[in-house]
Interface confidence: low
């Protein structure tokens, strides 16, 4: 790397991936292994984030950008930049202070994270329930009863795979 020549701030010419090394007459030195500088003019390089244990490496650290982590199976990311991993539950459950709990009747969760949400109220939109909701799936709303012409065969929704509501503990 060339010695910088700016009279005002010799460090300003040091590009990303380097740091301005005061110990070596302000020469732009490359970031050491496992460190990076994402902007120019840095006087130090930042230590790369290590994705260990519950964290899994999504993007390796480079001399100009930090590593990015996600979560190992059984966990999901929380917070900016996946600063935390929270334990998963199953679909049809939500994480509470007493562990993973089944969604109450009338609610569902189609993900391994987050909370149980109420089924859609089809009648609010003037529609009817086409497919019943379960703990894992929202109801499917169909056309309003008025939309069904007289004598038209009504669709019989399939029975849910299992009865929605709490399973015995």
């Amino acid at each position: 790397f060339e010695r910088t020549r700016s009279l005002q701030d010799p460090c300003s010419n040091c590009p990303a991936g380097t740091f301005c090394d005061n110990n070596r007459n302000q020469i732009c030195s490359p970031c050491p292994p496992n460190s990076f500088s994402s902007a120019g003019g840095q006087r130090t390089c930042d230590i790369c984030r290590q994705c260990k244990g519950v964290f899994r490496t999504r993007k390796e650290c480079s001399s100009t950008s930090n590593a990015e982590c996600d979560c190992t199976p059984g966990f999901h990311c929380l917070g900016a930049g996946c600063s935390m991993c929270e334990q998963d539950c199953k679909q049809g459950q939500e994480l509470t202070k007493k562990g993973c709990k089944d969604c109450c009747f009338g609610t569902f969760n189609d993900q391994k994270r987050g909370i149980c949400r109420p089924w859609t109220n089809c009648s609010l939109d003037g529609k009817s329930v086409l497919v019943n909701g379960t703990k894992e799936r929202d109801v499917v709303c169909g056309p309003s009863p008025a939309d069904l012409s007289p004598g038209a065969s009504s669709v019989t929704p399939p029975a849910p795979a299992r009865e929605p509501g709490h399973s015995p503990q």
Epitope: K52, G53, V54, F55, T72, P73, G74, M84, E86, Q87, D88, C89, K90, Q93, L95, K97, K98, G99, C100, K101, D102, K112, S167, Q169
Partner: antibody, heavy 113, light 110 residues
Framework: SVEESGGRLVKPDESLTLTCTAS????????MTWVRQAPGKGLEYIGF?????DTSYASWSKGRFTISKASTTVDLKISSLTTEDTATYFC???????????WGPGTLVTVSS | AQVLTQTPSPVSAAVGGTVTINCQSS????????LSWYQQKPGQPPKRLIY???DLASGVPSRFKGSGSGTQFTLTISDLECDDAATYYC??????????FGGGTEVEFK
Amino acid sequence: SVEESGGRLVKPDESLTLTCTASGFSLSHYWMTWVRQAPGKGLEYIGFINVGGDTSYASWSKGRFTISKASTTVDLKISSLTTEDTATYFCGRGGLTFGWDLWGPGTLVTVSS
Amino acid sequence: AQVLTQTPSPVSAAVGGTVTINCQSSQSVYSNSFLSWYQQKPGQPPKRLIYSASDLASGVPSRFKGSGSGTQFTLTISDLECDDAATYYCAGVYSDNTYVFGGGTEVEFK
């Protein structure tokens, strides 16, 4: 409730499987952990298994200890036993977020030649 | 490796008094608050008292109070009763998914 079983007197280098039986709750709702306590010593975390069956171990227990589960039981397999493994082994219910809220009475493993 | 250091041990107490048990972590626990406290009596399994540093577990008397964040945590037991004689453990969760118990603090009565 949870209850451990399978503890007994074993010889060094043998293997042993301990079983934790869960009743009154579903293992699909709770994470389960194994912890041990040598005579007169403190509690020592071994590892856990989560609702999806994923496992995690303390750095010292990786390799020799294996946690698995069935519908109502959680097993801890210990291989290549040494006298240092002599301890009471506890099974606990809960999770990392909120701690372990329900424990069994423990099962004693004695390793001696 | 992460270490949780508990002080003092043992601690001598008087019925009706207050004891404070400190738990210092060699590095910040997960989310600065993933720390639990357990009570254990001889021949019994641990009993969860506190989780998330300060939340009281169900069925635990409000005489037990947890506080702290990051690397410094405290369990305070007030209005001590004879039944509180036990060993108390802190336990922390760390970002690498490690779960660590402290060495334990024995509470005994004068």
